[in-house]
């Protein structure tokens, strides 16, 4: 669809005569008839296949024709067509004399014709005017012409219909050749596909408008590249949705069981060394001068009985001092000036000479120690109590006071977490090193089988298009993780471009 436009510029008829040579009375009141038709090697009379148009009286004898396109559209003359422009044409322009006001062909005498020109040739669609001048014996006509496409028609022959739009059917403007030019933020053959936020994950994100990044189930973050861990996951991460991979030092289904009490709570005081010994269980190894489960108690330096051979200990600001009994000397009264002759062994200990009598050694009876058998044996010095148990001397024996969760002579046994039947609704209890685990019967979930649930929401295979189904244990619903190319709560919608429009 397009328009052949003819712009009449000047007509010269100096003598004011008709084609027959007869003069017009009083002058030639001139109007034009235009016939546009298909290409003919020799332009002949016949139907004006591309259209006709007539003008009103434009002037008398010789005159210039005003450009009247702004005020009524009479010049240039418009010859619209509703077909593909063939690129060739024939044009007949007749100048007629109008004796009266009736310009209809049947109202005019046949000899009212002033002049007739006929041209034919090639004409491409375009904005540029072609200027032409046709001269006969008595007249001259100067004019220009062109072919342009109608609104919304494009291409070399005005055959491509294109209407700019910005709605659900497309977001584009039309190029001169009729091809689409997508508006910013849109892509695809018909500019229906939004360009998502730069960096938005191809599989895990999508968008319904430009510069957006909406996450598919199981993903989060500005670019939908962070998986969502299992609901309730405390100290864990994920690499795929709904996982709960525990951080170092944490265990359990929700990574909420503390396996590294030492690091997370630093219970040992005064520079003691902490050792994990189970879930929420630890042992502190105290530095010299400290005691207590958490090495929180400061010992007097004399408490370790550093003075040997019956020497008495005196606390001092910078340490301690041993007052040695007669016959002994040294920092800890460890050197003897005595021999067996001096009966140095107490509590029934037997004396043995050494170094040809220059020294001696005492062999102590049970429950006594020291170089002179002067000390009762402290059965707690070897830290026999495990799992942070506290050692207590009880006369000739010792006992361990255990921390909660442990039992046995040396606190070496875990109290069975399952002994109190913690699993509800018939769940089976399993003792673990770091606590217990309940295996729940169908229809129940939770750490202690306390939550009544429906049967596995994924059992009915609700996800389409080979999507992965995850059961959300906290809500007993399913979540579908869609493969690339599908969206929807069940991955039921394909994402790809729609098939082609027909235009």
């Amino acid at each position: 669809s397009g328009v052949f436009q003819l712009q009449l510029q000047e007509f010269i008829n100096e003598r004011g005569v008709l084609a027959s040579g007869r003069p017009c009375e009083p002058g030639c009141r001139t109007f034009f008839r235009v016939c546009l038709k298909h290409f003919q090697a020799v332009v002949s009379p016949g139907p004006c296949t591309f259209g006709t148009v007539s003008t009103p009286v434009l002037g008398t004898n010789s005159f210039a024709v005003r450009d009247d396109s702004s005020g009524g559209g009479r010049n240039p003359l418009q010859l619209p067509f509703n077909f593909t422009w063939p690129g060739t044409f024939s044009l007949i322009i007749e100048a007629w004399h109008a004796p009266g006001d009736d310009l209809r062909p049947e109202a005019l005498p046949p000899d009212a014709l002033i002049s007739k020109i006929a041209i034919q040739g090639s004409l491409a669609v375009g904005q540029n005017w072609l200027l032409d001048e046709q001269t006969s014996t008595l007249t001259r006509l100067r004019y220009s012409y062109r072919v342009i496409c109608s609104d919304n028609y494009y291409g070399d022959n005005c055959s491509r219909l294109c209407k700019k739009r910005n709605d659900h059917f497309g977001h584009y403007v039309c190029q001169p050749d009729g091809n689409l030019s997508c508006l910013p933020g849109w892509t695809g053959e018909y500019c229906q596909q939004p360009i998502c936020l730069s960096g938005c994950h191809e599989q895990n994100g999508y968008c319904s408008k430009p510069a957006e990044c909406l996450c598919r189930p199981g993903w989060q973050g500005r670019l939908c590249n962070e998986c969502i861990p299992h609901n309730g996951c405390r100290h864990g991460t994920c690499s795929t949705p709904w996982q709960c991979t525990c951080d170092e030092g944490w265990g359990g289904l929700f990574c909420d069981q503390d396996l590294n009490y030492c690091t997370h709570h630093s219970p040992c005081k005064n520079g003691a060394t902490c050792s994990n010994s189970g879930q929420r269980s630890y042992t502190c190894t105290c530095r010299p001068g400290y005691t207590g489960v958490d090495c929180e108690l400061e010992l007097s330096e004399c408490d370790s009985n550093p003075c040997r051979n019956g020497g008495s200990c005196k606390d001092q600001e910078d340490g301690y001092h041993c007052l040695c009994p007669p016959g002994y000397y040294g920092l800890h009264c460890e050197h003897s000036t005595l021999s067996c002759a001096d009966s140095p062994c107490f509590n029934g200990g037997s004396c043995r000479e050494r170094n040809q009598g220059a020294n001696y050694a005492c062999e102590c009876p049970p429950n006594f120690t020291g170089s002179n058998c002067e000390k009762k044996v402290d059965r707690c010095t070897s830290n026999p109590c495990a799992n942070g148990g506290q050692c207590l001397n009880r006369g000739p024996s010792r006992m361990c006071r255990c921390r909660p969760g442990f039992t046995g002579t040396y606190c070496e046994l875990h109290v069975s977490d399952c002994a109190r039947n913690p699993c509800a609704h018939g769940g089976t209890c399993h003792d673990l090193e770091n606590g217990l685990m309940c295996t729940c019967p169908a229809g129940f979930s939770g750490r202690r089988c306390e939550v009544r649930t429906s049967i596995d929401a994924c059992a009915s295979s609700p996800c389409f298009n080979r999507a992965t189904c995850y059961t959300d244990l906290s809500t007993d619903t399913f979540v579908c993780n869609c493969p690339y190319g599908f969206v929807g709560s069940r991955c039921e919608f394909p994402v790809g471009l729609p098939p082609s429009f027909p235009w």
Epitope: D151, N152, F169, G488, F493, P498, P502, W503
Partner: antibody, heavy 121, light 106 residues
């Protein structure tokens, strides 16, 4: 051959919610080649578009009805539904569901046979 | 809101050409389509995208659209063409229907 069939109550009381379902047979409602819509026609009057939804799950409504209308889809049943709340006698009409095709853009090329809904107490 | 205006009625003699107009602001910049509706029946699409015919629609139905007006032309009108005709276009994701024209074949 794709066919559309509307169903729902023929009588609704004023202030209640009108609910209709369109069942699609002979084609998939989740195909990216189609869009779907509801159109109504009061007795003796012209056609009025209610709303449409698309394969990308975008939904558009007639601005004059937007506050009262909801269109939803159930792909498992190959159905889409219309809910119009707070109805009055002015909502009495034949309600049509229709399909638009990407191959026939900007038009509804297949229509259901329509179902008459009367709003009256 | 966008409006499309149609004449309420048009009459034509059998065999003659019937023209039904639909006017709207810059309608030529949108794609227009036309539906035929006979009493008691659902609408049937007869012209889409200004001037295209769906399969099964007779060649006597044609359309044009430019400026502020779209036209449905039925050449060689037959008695069976007597019906209501509706134009429709989209404006910003909203479908708009004309008020309808009753075509009477005399």
């Amino acid at each position: 051959q794709l066919q559309l069939q509307e169903s729902g109550p023929g009588l609704v009381k004023p202030s209640e919610t009108l609910s209709l379902t369109c069942t699609v047979s002979g084609g998939s409602i989740s195909s990216s080649s189609y869009y779907w819509g509801w159109i109504r026609q009061p007795p003796g009057k012209g056609l009025e578009w209610i709303g449409s939804f698309y394969y990308s799950r975008s939904t558009y409504y007639n601005p004059s009805l937007k506050s009262r209308v909801t269109i939803s889809v159930d792909t498992s049943k190959n159905q889409f539904s219309l809910k119009l709340s707070s109805v009055t006698a002015a909502d009495t009409a034949v309600h049509y569901c229709a399909r638009g095709s990407i191959a026939v853009p900007d038009a509804f090329d297949i229509w259901g046979q329509g179902t008459m809904v009367t709003v009256s107490s | 809101s966008y409006e499309l205006t149609q004449p309420p009625s048009v009459s034509v003699s059998p065999g003659q050409t019937a023209s039904i107009t639909c006017s709207g602001d810059k309608l030529g910049d949108k794609f227009a389509c036309w539906y035929q509706q006979k009493p008691g029946h659902s609408p049937v699409l007869v012209v889409y995208q200004d001037n295209k015919r769906p399969s099964g629609i007779p060649e006597r139905f044609s359309g044009s659209n430019s400026g502020n007006s779209a036209t449905l032309t039925i050449s060689g009108t037959q008695a069976m063409d007597e019906a209501d005709y509706y134009c429709q276009a989209w404006d910003s994701n909203t479908a708009v229907f004309g008020g309808g024209t009753k075509l009477t074949v005399l």
